[in-house]
């Protein structure tokens, strides 16, 4: 089952996600999407990183921490009831089916 996180309408929501880079600066791509993690990639992508930097993000969705050190937690600004639901944080580790997938449930009050 998904870990549940809560936020109030008009506030910021924080969805934690971490990994340990194999070596300093040796990053793997990460994607955040709305909806449970599918077999591959992320559905409804809201933010994505590559091996170096953030390369895609959408309004109100931001990386919250020091992602170059493995903190890929997500901040959603000024949430509404429509932001409720499951979010997928996917650590895209090279190789067949090596990805780490985290489904996080956001409840807006």
């Amino acid at each position: 089952s998904e870990v549940e996180y809560r936020a109030e309408v008009g506030q910021n929501a924080y969805l934690p996600c971490f990994y340990t880079p194999a070596a300093p600066g040796n990053l793997v791509p990460v994607c955040w999407g709305k909806g449970a993690c599918p077999v591959f990639e992320c559905g409804n992508v809201v933010l994505r990183t590559d091996e170096r930097d953030v390369n895609y993000w959408t309004s109100r969705y931001w990386l919250n921490g020091d992602f170059r050190k493995g903190d890929v937690s997500l901040t959603i600004e000024n949430v509404t009831l429509a932001d409720s639901g499951i979010y997928c944080c996917r650590i895209q580790i090279p190789g067949i089916m090596n990805d780490e997938k985290f489904n996080l449930k956001l409840v807006i009050k």
């Epitope: 300093p24 990183t49 953030v54 309004s59 109100r60 990386l63 020091d66 050190k69 000024n78």
Partner: antibody, heavy 122, light 109 residues
Framework: EVQLLESGGGLVQPGGSLRLSCAAS????????MSWVRQAPGKGLEWVSA????????YYADSVKGRFTISRDNSKNTLYLQMNSLRAEDTAVYYC???????????????WGQGTLVTVSS | SYVLTQPPSVSVAPGKTARITCGGD??????VHWYQQKPGQAPVLVIY???DRPSGIPERFSGSNSGNTATLTISRVEAGDEADYYC???????????FGGGTKLTVLG
């Protein structure tokens, strides 16, 4: 080309107020966190305040909390710093600086303005 | 609160290598960024995320970060490298940006 142009500096008496502006161009302003950084004469850099891209979250150094207010008008591509209850130790060149792509706090300062001098003296 | 410690000054002969350190408790767990500031000018980003170099910055500038020390290395130093150099981190415990005290690099001769 990214450009940041500060204005509003000048001479003000202790206890007085001043409002700094930073006009931004050459990038999608609302997509970036912004900060103010200051430098007292002959001293090092000191971060003053930051604001998220939407303006929904603000952060302050302890030395200015309660006296300074950061804000932004994304429709005008402009960053502001309202400075109240000014003290002699607030005398400095004030720079506005743009944060990094896709990060809530900005993480580092990719582009800087040329600065505006604020002098607090009687 | 978190403190970044830099040597006040470093001197180096032209063509040699200058190393400027930035000390902090487990600074290797944070991303470090470096700025160059020449007299009367605004700071310029020279290294970000420990070791990445912005476009336009010469390859002579490099960075590393591990343990309690981050280092900015300038190889084949030129007279034009004479400036103040500052390290910077984002301290997520306080949500404050922190700068080191700055290091004045003097190019001898």
């Amino acid at each position: 080309e990214v450009q940041l142009l500060e204005s509003g500096g000048g001479l003000v008496q202790p206890g007085g107020s001043l409002r700094l502006s930073c006009a931004a161009s050459g990038f999608t302003f609302s997509s970036y966190a912004m900060s103010w950084v200051r430098q007292a004469p002959g001293k090092g850099l000191e971060w003053v305040s930051a604001i998220s891209g939407s303006g929904g979250s603000t952060y302050y150094a302890d030395s200015v909390k309660g006296r300074f207010t950061i804000s932004r008008d994304n429709s005008k591509n402009t960053l502001y710093l309202q400075m109240n209850s000014l003290r002699a130790e607030d005398t400095a060149v004030y720079y506005c600086a743009r944060g990094s792509y896709g990060t809530y706090y900005g993480n580092y300062f990719e582009y800087w303005g040329q600065g505006t001098l604020v002098t607090v003296s009687s | 609160s978190y403190v970044l410690t830099q040597p006040p000054s470093v001197s180096v002969a032209p063509g040699k290598t200058a190393r400027i350190t930035c000390g902090g408790d487990n600074i290797g767990g944070k991303s470090v960024h470096w700025y160059q500031q020449k007299p009367g000018q605004a700071p310029v980003l020279v290294i970000y995320y420990d070791s990445d170099r912005p476009s336009g910055i010469p390859e002579r500038f490099s960075g590393s970060n591990s343990g309690n020390t981050a280092t900015l290395t300038i190889s084949r130093v030129e007279a034009g490298d004479e400036a103040d150099y500052y390290c910077q981190v984002l301290d997520r415990r306080s949500d404050h940006f922190l700068f080191g005290g700055g290091t004045k690099l003097t190019v001898l001769g």
